[in-house]
Interface confidence: medium
């Protein structure tokens, strides 16, 4: 049998008596910023090079007794999880360790910064293949640590970090809150979020995905053949660093954006029991458990998209929230969500030469979220077409008029506090797939894209009786790019994409009463790229 | 004792290298901001990361660090430059009294200053 954690991340076709998926990450170097390590442990001997970098604070307490095996414990275990020859994920990956945590597992932001700088300088002096940096540590939110991670990521380095073990919003911690970093929460053998004493894994919109992080067998620094079971988001992050090394070894040219999208795409979906998370965090927390891709090649043809939630706008009347895609991603649609239902919609707008998704709070609202649908679409040319409020009974319309441009998303934004009870369809009338339609007092925004072989279609699911939630999913081979609602008179809280499903939320039926409430229709825009599919077939 | 000697030596050097030009007013533009960890027990007051504007060169970082030392010395404060950053972010790590933050925030090229804080194995 193989340990539960390795089984969980391994697609069924790899499973055998021994966990030995093809190519163990041998083209990739993984940097570990942690405690000192026991480099002669059988699991990692010859695989981990201990650099001369050390920047740690003194241990607390005058009576602290330095014991080598305890000093090495955390780092040794993680090195084993990443590349251990028997209990590791990427058995072929080589590692370099930097000591930024002392014998009590404590370090400083400044020491970590200097460590990251050391990696960047090493990369410049001796460029090698793909680099993965594992940061199995967390501190309070730090602007400077996040900025350093951003710079390193933009230099082509993949950074993977622990979400934190504080049973709290990961956005309050660094480097977990850095958007460029792949932030990993922890789940157990039952796919439950990991509880650690009175605390547990962090959660929220800053977490990219979860991975095994409880009762993980790995190298123990007690002796060169000892093993120990450890738990935490560090262990979870180590799994993802190993998976990233495997993926990069198979496809060394992958960008950070491509790698992140693949990690999300190949994750197990909707297996985590969300009841563990605070209610207000459930919608924001990704229900994804990391896994290796079923085959190392052939994923290139797919149109990959992910959902990015903004921070909460706050309750002030003119408050807005902004969701952004990564530099290599295209914003294909923008939606908004408010728990109170009081919002003034959303719009796509240019900011620093890039489209962002901005949601607007309304008077008396508790705040809004902007939700961006961020996709990998090579050679894309996207623009936003806006129609101002029409003030005509027929409503506001906007369509993609340029030749070869297809509609990937619709947004609607209104200045008035209340659009009234009669909201005509937010999307196009039937038979006009390249058109968005909205209330006459709202401005409507169509996201129109041209990319080789890109085709899109609209899919609706309407429920006549009022429902708290209406969903519509794109079928196999199609990717959800846009998600919005065609409301009747029901009070829509907003719309957002969860994996390939468009979710439209309405106010709780029990509080609104269902007598006069109208139907709610969830509208998905589903796209695929024939060009990407063709290119992939030609390669094979 | 060693540390004190080191600090004294740096103070003397800072005073010696002070020039009229070092006292010039900071560049006009946006005011630099100060950040610190929201979790009080994790704060490490007395050590600060001074982050300079994106295009600042290493020589300017070193000059700004020396300027801070000189201006601090003029006010009777010891400072110690622990590290000069370049490669990822321009800036420097300085050990100094929090009393000097206002002064440091007015230095040319400064984007923001962050008080050092703890990180922990997870």
């Amino acid at each position: 049998s193989i340990p539960w954690n390795l089984e969980r991340i391994t697609p069924p076709r790899y499973r055998a008596d021994e966990y030995q998926p093809p190519d163990g990450g041998s083209l990739v170097e993984v940097y570990l910023l942690d405690t000192s390590i026991q480099s002669d442990h059988r699991e990692i001997e010859g695989r981990v090079m201990v650099t001369d970098f050390e920047n740690v604070p003194e241990e607390d307490g005058t009576r602290f007794h330095r014991q080598a095996s305890k000093c090495d414990s955390h780092g040794t275990h993680l090195a084993g999880v990443v590349s251990g020859r028997d209990a590791g994920v990427a058995k072929g990956a080589s590692m370099r360790s930097l000591r930024v945590l002392n014998c009590q597992g404590k370090g400083t932001v400044s020491g970590t910064l200097i460590g990251l700088e050391f990696i960047r300088k090493s990369q410049l002096v001796q460029p090698v293949g793909p680099l993965v940096v594992l940061l199995p540590l967390a501190g309070g939110y730090s602007r400077v640590l996040n900025a350093a991670c951003q710079r390193l990521a933009r230099a082509g380095v993949v950074l993977v970090t622990a979400a934190g073990n504080f049973r709290d919003d990961a956005c309050l911690y660094s480097p977990a809150s850095a958007p460029e970093v792949i932030t990993v929460g922890a789940t157990n053998a039952q796919d439950q979020p990991v509880t650690l004493g009175t605390l547990g894994t962090n959660f929220g919109r800053c977490v990219d995905l979860f991975a095994p992080g409880e009762d993980i067998i790995g190298a123990s620094s007690d002796c060169s053949t000892c093993f120990v079971s450890q738990s935490g988001t560090s262990q979870a992050a180590a799994h993802v660093a190993g998976i990233a090394a495997m993926m990069l070894s198979a496809e060394p040219e992958l960008t950070l954006a491509e790698l992140r999208q693949r990690l999300i795409h190949f994750s197990a979906k909707d297996v985590i029991n969300e009841a563990w998370f605070p209610e207000d965090q459930r919608v924001l927390t990704p229900n994804l458990v990391a896994a290796l891709p079923p085959s190392t090649h052939g994923a290139g043809w797919q149109l990959f998209c992910r959902t990015v939630w903004s921070a909460h706008s706050g309750p002030t009347r003119m408050a807005t929230a902004v969701a952004r895609c990564a530099p290599d991603e295209e914003l294909l649609s923008c939606s908004s969500f408010s728990r109170s239902g009081k919002r003034r919609g959303e719009r796509m707008e240019a900011q620093g030469g890039k489209l962002v998704c901005r949601a607007h709070n309304a008077f008396g609202g508790e705040g809004v979220y902007a939700i961006a649908r961020c996709c990998l679409l090579p050679q894309a040319n996207c623009s936003v077409h806006t129609a101002p409020p029409a003030e005509a009974s027929m409503g506001t319309r906007v369509h993609c008029h340029q030749q070869g441009h297809v509609l990937t998303g619709c947004s609607s934004h209104w200045e008035v506090e209340d659009l009234g009870t009669h909201k005509p369809p937010v999307l196009r009338p039937r038979g006009q797939p390249n058109q968005c339609v909205g209330h006459r007092e709202a401005s409507i925004h169509a996201s129109c894209c041209h990319a080789p072989g890109l085709e899109c279609k609209v899919k609706e699911h309407g429920i006549p009786a009022p429902q708290e939630q209406v969903t519509v999913a794109c079928e196999e081979g199609w990717t959800l790019t846009g998600c919005s609602a065609l409301p009747g008179t029901s009070h829509v809280l907003g719309a957002y994409a969860v994996d390939n499903t468009c979710v439209v939320r309405s106010r709780d039926v029990s509080t609104t009463g269902s007598t006069s409430e109208g139907a709610v229709t969830a509208v998905a825009i589903c796209c695929r790229s024939r060009h990407l599919a063709q290119a992939s077939q030609e390669l094979q | 004792q060693e540390d004190e000697d080191g600090d004294y030596e740096e103070l003397v050097l800072a005073l010696r290298s002070e020039e009229d030009g070092l006292a010039e007013a900071p560049e006009h533009g946006t005011t630099a901001t100060f950040h610190r960890c929201a979790k009080d027990p994790w704060r490490l007051p007395g050590t600060y990361v001074v982050v300079l504007k994106e295009e600042t060169h290493l020589s300017q970082s070193e000059r700004t660090a020396r300027r801070l030392q000189a201006q601090a010395a003029r006010r009777g404060y010891l400072t110690k430059i622990l590290h000069v950053f370049h490669g990822l972010l321009p800036g420097f790590l300085v050990k100094m009294s929090g009393d000097l933050l206002e002064l440091a925030l007015k230095l040319p090229h400064v984007d923001y200053i962050e008080e050092d804080s703890s990180v922990f194995a997870q």
């Epitope: 049998s1 193989i2 340990p3 002669d40 059988r42 001997e45 010859g46 020859r85 028997d86 209990a87 067998i217 007690d222 002796c223 060169s224 053949t225 000892c226 093993f227 120990v228 079971s229 | -």
Partner: antibody, heavy 121, light 109 residues
Framework: EVQLLESGGGLVQPGGSLRLSCKAS????????MHWVRQAPGKGLEWIGR????????KYNEKFKGKATISRDNSKNTLYLQMNSLRAEDTAVYYC??????????????WGQGTLVTVSS | DIQMTQSPSSLSASVGDRVTITCRAS??????LTWYQQKPGKAPKLLIY???SLQSGVPSRFSGSGSGTDFTLTISSLQPEDFATYYC???????????FGGGTKVEIK
Amino acid sequence: EVQLLESGGGLVQPGGSLRLSCKASGYTFSSYWMHWVRQAPGKGLEWIGRIDPYSGGTKYNEKFKGKATISRDNSKNTLYLQMNSLRAEDTAVYYCARYGYYLGSYAMDYWGQGTLVTVSS
Amino acid sequence: DIQMTQSPSSLSASVGDRVTITCRASQDVSRYLTWYQQKPGKAPKLLIYAASSLQSGVPSRFSGSGSGTDFTLTISSLQPEDFATYYCQAYDYSLSGYVFGGGTKVEIK
């Protein structure tokens, strides 16, 4: 099927030396540490040392340092034990054993059939 | 250095008997203790690893327990093929070496 086949045993003069071989098959040789263990007639098992075929790193029982040398040839999937300055008390059956990994522990899971070395004039 | 002491050094038992063999380490070896069975003229065979985990293919009448310094191998109902010598083996942290117990010979009564 994992198999370990020792050879090279026999009669050796006191003060002489010998080289034992252990040919491995049925698994990836470089992925598992290999041990040499001996057993004198009517006595218990005694560990001599081990090698990591992946890196070539070795560890020895203090008693055998300077007397035994363990090496390997990964291209031939073969483990070797060189013994020098042999004395009558080195008469024993010599076993090679694979060190297998079992969910957080190791054990000598496959053993060769053993080869008898007799040191006598 | 760690010493491994097995007791008894030999015992006589009948088919169907419950047999218990103990192994004591002079220092804590955690759960890193392995049991082997050896029949005359044959190589040792792995029975139990990590103190209590049964190697696949080994009958369930064999069980192991213990942690730290005291360990036990139990054969719940002795079978004719179980007459053999049993060795415990531990890992010596300080020497990065491997130490065997003196062996316990289980003979037919």
